[in-house]
């Protein structure tokens, strides 16, 4: 209730995640013209990214383009990107939508289509659609601990939301053990009232907020954190000009002297922690 | 139907030479590749020949003695192999791919192959 009486002031605060976590993926290989399962594990070094500020990011689903050379190859014949002569194909140019820099020629790029030929990582990235389920779709068992230090200047006072009495075997629940400070992903998403499983796909942003709302008078002190969940991201795939969350990343290495890469299109769930609050004191 | 016929494939002495050609027929090609099998080794790229600017990629076994050329005219490719070793025994065979260029055979294209045996 709001104590009139009091003197606020907002929140400062800084976080800290941690998350564990481990995948078994099960995929199609191609290796010398035949298809095969491929299993690999995939543990916390492979699927979290350090991001900037309060937010992490769990890598659900991906799409490789592997064993791309810096040469001249035709580019990918997406929507509007086929010719049937040079003169479709302008030497020099950079179509934000191509993969590479053009060098005039129109040339096969199968059997039936001819594309502009293209200076750039060859061959280039083809327009695949997201695997359905998403490769990593266990990750919904992963757990963060979410470290949360708070810190109010003008009353002099410090605290974090993890307590020296928590089991750190514990797991949130909004009932039974609020004030646990490691979430497992699949419940964040159950209590933001989103399907991980169908999230997962196409990736997106989930918000974690952490309120603060502190009573810092000595006889009725209370100053801990109280936890809720929203979808960030706009969740109408079908509606949304580019669904979801992903971003592009690539795996340097040498094969015979030629330096090659492996693109990987990570889909993913981004996490942002939205400390919030305020502390009053009389 | 997309072919790809090779031929000029013989018996030869160490030393000596033998020119391969390549002729395709029922599409236009880009890329494409000479490879060799030995018996009980694995196919391995030889050369590569870009048909848009003529480049060419030849791997170090047979750097400085073996030559790609093109007539575009014909829709053939030629490999010219001279000093010729022993260890150059093989069936060597032509595709649309490229591996040391990173050009998959989308279209295909693959030939049956002609031997070539070196003797010492």
């Known amino acids: 209730s709001d104590k009139l009486y009091q003197r606020k002031e907002p929140v400062i605060s800084s976080v800290h995640t941690k998350v564990k976590g481990i995948a078994e993926v099960t995929e199609n290989v191609t290796e010398g013209g035949v298809t095969k399962l491929g299993h690999s594990i995939f543990d916390t070094a492979d699927y979290t990214f350090p991001l900037q500020g309060n937010s992490f990011f769990v890598m659900t689903n991906y799409v490789k383009s592997e064993g791309q050379v810096q040469t001249l190859c035709p580019e990918y014949p997406r929507r509007g990107a086929q010719c049937s002569s040079d003169r479709r194909c302008k030497k020099g140019w950079m179509d934000p939508q191509s993969k590479g820099i053009q060098t005039g020629r129109c040339v096969p790029y199968d059997k039936t289509r001819k594309t502009c030929e293209v200076s750039a990582w060859c061959p280039t990235e083809e327009e695949k659609e997201a695997p359905r389920p998403a490769l990593l779709r266990s990750a919904e068992n992963f757990t963060v601990l979410i470290k949360n230090n708070i810190h109010f200047p003008g009353h002099n006072y410090t605290t974090r939301n993890i307590l020296p009495t928590m089991n750190g075997s514990c797991t949130f629940h909004k009932t039974w053990d609020p004030q646990c400070s490691i979430f497992r992903l699949g419940d964040i998403f159950q209590e933001a009232g989103e399907n991980f499983t169908e999230v997962a796909v196409q990736g997106g942003i989930m918000g974690i907020e952490i309120y603060w709302d502190c009573n810092l008078d000595s006889w009725s002190h209370h100053c801990r954190p109280r936890y809720s969940f929203r979808r960030l991201d706009d969740k109408n795939t079908d509606e949304s000009f580019v669904p979801g969350y992903n971003f592009r990343y690539a795996k340097y290495y040498k094969e015979n002297n030629v330096e090659k890469r492996t693109l990987i299109k990570a889909f993913g769930i981004r996490f942002d922690i939205l400390v919030f609050g305020t502390g009053g004191k009389f | 139907e997309v072919q790809l016929v090779e031929s000029g494939g013989g018996l030869v002495q160490s030393g000596g030479s033998l020119r391969l050609s390549c002729a395709g027929s029922?599409?236009?090609?880009?890329?494409i590749g000479w490879f060799r099998q030995a018996p009980g080794k694995e196919r391995e790229e030889v050369s590569c020949i870009r048909v848009t600017d003529g480049s060419t990629y030849h791997t170090n076994s047979v750097k400085g003695r073996f030559t790609m050329s093109r007539d575009n005219a014909e829709n053939t490719v030629y490999l010219q192999m001279n000093s010729l070793k022993p260890e150059d025994t093989a069936v060597y065979s032509c595709?649309?791919?490229?591996?040391?260029?990173?050009?998959?055979?989308?279209?295909?294209?693959r030939g049956q192959g002609t031997q070539v045996t070196v003797s010492s």
């Open positions: 029922g599409f236009s090609y880009y890329i």
């Open positions: 595709a649309t791919e490229c591996q040391r260029w990173a050009y998959p055979n989308r279209i295909g294209a």
